[in-house]
């Protein structure tokens, strides 16, 4: 959470940004809020990126102005125009790329004053894991798959029954490069599993942490997955 103050004569407004992460190939949001101003035509929003000449996006007089937009953002940015009057200056970013990572500035000018705040934007790839019982294996085993990760994550297994156990000797993890030659598919197999136990497959890099749980009993298989972005907010 970053709060910036701007001073214009005697006037300053509070601008707030949130560190966030973008998933390569998907759409992202760079979050920025400011003190609302009902006079839409008097609001100017400028998004800038450190090291880039030209603007990421500009919104003024109630509409976009892409005249000064840098080429790398062409056709890829939009504000939530209907939410600007209530203080939302967040930016939609289409088809996030690795090169979009960096420090962004959200600059606001309204009839009340002006202000700005910086935002650290991380980019990578992260996806939910899915665990299945691998019936093809010679012994009962579990297969954890997640389709898109970058940078290469670490993978660890845990068990409810054998808490604290190290499963690295009885698991095998591979990383397969996807067709776009950036992200990778993660596959990890855990061998010699026992029934009536809950196993967790944890995948983590510096951007996200994902966990897939599976409970195998005589009568059913229960699954659960969750994904958490790291260092956000």
């Amino acid at each position: 959470l970053i709060i910036g103050f701007g001073i214009s004569g005697k006037h300053f407004i509070t601008v707030t940004t949130f560190t966030s992460a973008g998933n390569i190939g998907e759409d992202g949001t760079l979050s920025c809020t400011f003190e609302p101003d009902i006079k839409l035509n008097g609001i100017v929003i400028q998004w800038l990126k450190e090291g880039i000449k030209g603007l990421v996006h500009e919104f003024k007089e109630g509409k976009d102005d892409l005249s000064q937009q840098h080429e790398m953002f062409r056709g890829r940015t939009a504000v939530f125009a209907d939410q600007v009057v209530v203080g939302n200056a967040s930016l939609r970013l289409k088809n996030v790329q690795l090169t979009d990572a960096g420090t962004y500035t959200c600059y606001i000018r309204t009839s009340k004053g002006k202000g700005n705040a910086n935002l650290e934007y991380k980019t990578g790839a992260f996806s939910m894991p899915e665990i299945n019982v691998d019936y093809n294996a010679s012994s009962e085993s579990l297969r954890c798959e997640a389709p898109r990760w970058f940078p290469q994550p670490t993978v660890a297994w845990a068990s409810q029954v054998d808490q604290g156990a190290n499963f690295s000797e009885v698991s095998n993890t591979s990383f397969e490069l996807n067709s776009e030659n950036v992200t990778m598919k993660v596959v990890s197999v855990l061998y010699n599993v026992t029934i009536n136990n809950t196993y967790s497959c944890m995948i983590e890099n510096d951007i996200a942490k994902a966990t897939g749980d599976i409970k195998v009993t005589d009568s059913e298989v229960k699954r659960r997955s969750q994904l958490q972005l790291l260092n956000s907010g």
């Epitope: 509409k63 892409l66 088809n95």
Partner: antibody, heavy 120, light 108 residues
């Protein structure tokens, strides 16, 4: 309702420059929400995006044609233009102008197209 | 650039039949940025579907789009005589904008 109309010579000699103009009517070319683009279609073949321009004059070209393409805009006439230099027979095509959403980048209004033949 | 491959090249069907056209991308494309166009002989292409599944203004509901990632489909539920044409998919995720090679839907 918005309409686009291409105009220009139907015959261009090899090595010369192809020049076309698109006139926008029923709306302003200075709209902040759109790019104005050119697309071409060789006889019996598919569509190829050439590039686009914003009303302020900023452009983006297809890398495969970038060295030969210039797109310009004249807001006072509500027109934008295409120039393609050093043409060969491979540039023979129907050339379309179109309106492109600045974020959706979908081509939602097209001109009817104009056939340009490159021949001596 | 993103390469789009359409199949089949030609689809021979009768009026009233169902048409299923495929578009495959060389890399994952967000479903928000896949469009379909219809082109009749001597005419400019016309936008049919945007965002993979949203119909453009004035497009009949017999046209529907679906898909995500690298595989997208245009379906015409019951072919009308005016639907026999060439159909193109287009990716709008990144520049340069690219089109598939087209599928011709012809009368059987």
């Amino acid at each position: 309702q918005l309409q686009l109309q291409e105009s220009g010579p139907g015959l261009v000699k090899p090595s010369e420059t192809l020049s076309l103009t698109c006139t926008v009517s029923g709306g302003s070319i200075s709209s902040s929400s759109y790019y104005w683009g050119w697309i071409r279609q060789p006889p019996g073949k598919g569509l190829e995006w050439i590039g686009n321009i914003y009303y302020s004059g900023s452009t983006y070209y297809n890398p495969s044609l970038k060295s030969r393409v210039t797109i310009s805009v004249d807001t006072s006439k509500n027109q934008f233009s295409l120039k393609l230099s050093s043409v060969t027979a491979a540039d023979t095509a129907v050339y379309y102008c179109a309106r492109e959403g600045s974020y959706t980048t979908v081509l939602n209004v097209w001109g009817q197209g104009t056939m340009v033949t490159v021949s001596s | 650039e993103i390469v789009l491959t359409q199949s089949p090249g030609t689809l021979s069907l009768s009026p009233g039949e169902r048409a299923t056209l495929s578009c495959r991308a060389s890399q994952s494309v967000s479903s928000s940025y896949l469009a379909w166009y219809q082109q009749k002989p001597g005419q400019a292409p016309r936008l049919l579907i945007y965002g993979a599944s949203s119909r453009a203004t004035g497009i009949p509901d017999r046209f529907s789009g679906s898909g995500s990632g690298t595989d997208f489909t245009l379906t015409i539920s019951r072919l009308e005589p005016e639907d026999f044409a060439v159909y193109y998919c287009q990716q709008a995720a990144s520049y340069p904008l690219t089109f598939g090679g087209g599928t011709k839907v012809e009368i059987k």
